[in-house]
């Protein structure tokens, strides 16, 4: 699987999950989250050659098409597969609230 | 929705489904399919700016991150959302067989 275990410990050039830290204030302009100040969101990057973690029958077809037509703009794209939630603390006035924001962290990628 | 109805009738620059015809022999090297000779597979293409048909909470965050950091390589990607099957005819010896190939045609796209 193109997950953090594999991708973070390799120099994989093809589609893989990459490290990305997002600071809520600086990168998103969000002031309302108190904790954490930011988080490791990660992102997916890398080419999707034929056979590389292809998501559907269509992805396989498109990767094969791309192999036969290298100049074509039609190609599968490296996108998130497994996402995880992020627990946050925000304040309603002086009162702290804990919330789980779903689908915030990329754990693995796929070619779609 | 970024579907064929909208995308094929507009000059949309952002993520949208685009027309693509695939010839089984020429583009894939598949000789085993008898009918059709090819099909309108379509493909997804176009930038994914903030708010543009974003798939998950993560996609929203990443698009917002990209807006604050325009030079970053981390950005959502335009990929298939709705896929449809393709009925094909192939031969086993002299006997024709009809088969549905699932997830072969892109009907709509999303930013993931």
């Amino acid at each position: 699987a193109l997950d953090t275990n594999y991708c973070f410990s390799s120099t994989e050039k093809n589609c893989c999950v990459r490290q990305l830290y997002i600071d809520f204030r600086k990168d998103l302009g969000w002031k309302w989250i108190h904790e954490p100040k930011g988080y490791h969101a990660n992102f997916c990057l890398g080419p999707c050659p034929y056979i590389w973690s292809l998501d559907t029958q269509y992805s396989k077809v498109l990767a094969l098409y791309n192999q036969h037509n290298p100049g074509a703009s039609a190609a599968p794209c490296c996108v998130p597969q497994a996402l995880e939630p992020l627990p946050i603390v925000y304040y309603v006035g002086r009162k702290p609230k804990v919330e789980q924001l779903s689908n915030m962290i990329v754990r693995s990628c796929k070619c779609s | 929705a970024l579907d064929t109805n909208y995308c094929f009738s507009s000059t949309e620059k952002n993520c949208c489904v685009r027309q693509l015809y695939i010839d089984f022999r020429k583009d894939l090297g598949w000789k085993w399919i008898h009918e059709p000779k090819g099909y309108h597979a379509n493909f997804c293409l176009g930038p994914c700016p903030y708010i543009w048909s974003l798939d998950t909470q993560y996609s929203k965050v990443l698009a917002l991150y990209n807006q604050h950091n325009p030079g970053a390589s981390a950005a959502p990607c335009c990929v298939p959302q709705a896929l449809e099957p393709l009925p094909i005819v192939y031969y086993v010896g002299r006997k024709p067989k009809v088969e549905q190939l699932s997830n072969m045609i892109v009907r709509s796209c999303k930013c993931s």
Epitope: K31, W32, Y91 | I51, Q57, V61
Partner: antibody
Amino acid sequence: QVQLVQSGAEVKKPGSSVKVSCKASGYTFSSNVISWVRQAPGQGLEWMGGVIPIVDIAYYAQRFKGRVTITADESTSTTYMELSSLRSEDTAVYYCASTLGLVLDAMDYWGQGTLVTVSS
Amino acid sequence: ETVLTQSPGTLSLSPGERATLSCRASQSLGSSYLAWYQQKPGQAPRLLIYGASSRAPGIPDRFSGSGSGTDFTLTISRLEPEDFAVYYCQQYADSPITFGQGTRLEIK
């Protein structure tokens, strides 16, 4: 510049519902928090609740809970405030306002207001 | 809920004079959870001061805010003709947000 443009005046019957919209432009909608405040004719200001658009977390003043629903549609940068079981005392100008960034906060940009009249 | 009491209810002054508006909270707000607004007839409120003493962007420096705990003050050092309006204080320390009943500043 930042603008919050609200939907037009409404006349409603007691017992019915009203949905007021507030469309934002000139800033990143989802980086902000939107509050709703109302003002009865000749009266003071009363906070109803608010929403964090990007995560759709809504919160309400206790006295409006169960009667008000605040939602956000990111694709159109629009916030909505729906008030149900209307009574004559709900006749007021309804304002949306963006906060300085926190959930409960001062409000720096305001819509032009929407007059809702409840009358039989 | 936190009740805010503004005084006086009406303040009659002449242009050029100094105006002092008071806002008292029924419980302590700390030092940074109070805002002041100006409202003119037929218009939405306009933020003047937030965090008890910080001026909002574009607000003239004749407006200043002070105070902490339960007692807060808005001061307009030298009244201009356009300053005559209704002024509201607002607390955002606790839910629900509450506003004072307003002080009407009128021309004497």
